[in-house]
């Protein structure tokens, strides 16, 4: 028998994948354990085998359909379940009844890029992945800018309290290096949490022009 | 829906090998556990070995451990067998099967399968 605390995580894309994480204090590394997904309204189950991302905690993705498909609707209730072998049996490790529209979390934004860039000024725009026509426009963004010499820990937090996939950096030095993140979450879900932040976009603002000599 | 290709089947003789692929189309490859079922003549469709998802794991019956080797290549979307020290006992047809749920894929009922390809080894 395995002893200790338990927790079972797991977050909804809003399409087609649900990820999740299994923490065991205790448990062994070379067991084999499922996540096993049981919908109440549909005809399919699904399951991911759980792989170790540290000393007691698994993670795996429950790949629902192609990337865009939307697999569940807010009305959707999964049954999920740890199941890890024990000899010849499987033995339920956890469970919870998974409400998708609960438990979200997006893909990270893809496809940064620089739309226009001036000596204290940047203009960036992006794209969401993967995320439900369900949302019309009810999403929220956080952004964030690293500059030379800080951590992104330090860099302060801009938010965008409505689907602008754009953002207009201001007050920024002339000819210096930055790199941008942004980050997505639905305004639905008690659970809901802040997608991943995306790849770092690079970018350099313009050198000031040499003023005349007074 | 999805669609499975075996290949690699033929006559061989006792002591050699084989290696059979099947090859998925028509959905994302990684959601499904594949698994490797054979039928002798006259008899009903027996359970070789079985992979799940990631990879990570291969469970086969007791009369291939040792000699049969399941793997898979998610970036090629193919499921392989290879089958080494053939007895005439393999002799079969074999076929690739796929299913969403690990636990249901020994229950031959709701997967999905190739059309087979036979394996006969001489004595």
């Known amino acids: 028998a395995v002893n200790g605390t338990s927790q079972f995580t797991c977050f909804y894309n809003s399409r087609a994948n649900i990820s999740c994480v299994w923490s065991q204090d205790g448990a062994l590394q070379d067991t084999s354990c499922q996540v096993h997904a049981w919908p109440d309204r549909r005809r399919w189950n699904q399951t991911c085998e759980l792989l170790p991302v540290s000393q007691a905690s698994w993670a795996c993705n429950l790949i629902l359909g192609a990337p865009d498909s939307q697999k569940l609707t807010t009305v959707d209730i999964v049954t999920l379940r740890v199941l890890c072998r024990e000899g010849v049996r499987w033995r339920v490790m956890a469970i919870q009844d998974f409400k998708p529209f609960e438990n979200l979390r997006l893909m990270a934004p893809i496809s940064l890029q620089v739309v226009h860039v001036e000596t204290h000024r940047c203009n960036i725009s992006w794209e969401i992945s993967q995320a439900s026509h369900y949302f019309e426009r009810h999403l929220e963004f956080e952004a964030r800018t690293l500059s030379p010499g800080h951590t992104w820990e330090e860099a302060p937090l801009l938010t965008l309290k409505q689907k602008q996939e754009w953002i207009c950096l201001e007050t920024l030095t002339p000819d210096t290096q930055y790199e941008f993140q942004v980050r997505v979450k639905p305004l639905q879900g008690e659970f809901t949490t802040w997608s991943p932040w995306s790849q770092p976009l690079a970018f350099r603002t313009k050198p000031a022009a040499l003023g005349k000599d007074t | 829906e999805v669609q499975l290709v075996e290949s690699g089947g033929g006559l061989v003789q006792a002591g050699g090998s084989l290696r059979l692929s099947c090859v998925v189309s028509?959905?994302?490859?990684?959601?499904?556990?594949m698994a490797w079922f054979r039928q002798a003549p006259g008899k009903g469709r027996e359970f070789v070995a079985v992979?799940?998802?990631?990879?990570?794991?291969?469970e086969y019956v007791d009369s291939v451990k040792g000699r049969f080797t399941v793997s898979r290549d998610n970036a090629k979307n193919t499921v392989y067998l290879q089958m080494n020290n053939l007895k005439p006992e393999d002799t079969a047809v074999y076929y690739c099967?796929?299913?969403?749920?690990?636990?249901?894929?020994?229950?031959?009922?709701?997967?999905?399968w190739g059309q087979g390809t036979q394996v006969t080894v001489s004595s």
């Open positions: 099967a796929a299913n969403t749920d690990y636990f249901q894929i020994r229950s031959v009922d709701n997967n999905a």
């Open positions: 028509g959905d994302v490859f990684v959601r499904y556990t």
């Open positions: 992979v799940t998802d990631s990879g990570r794991t291969t």
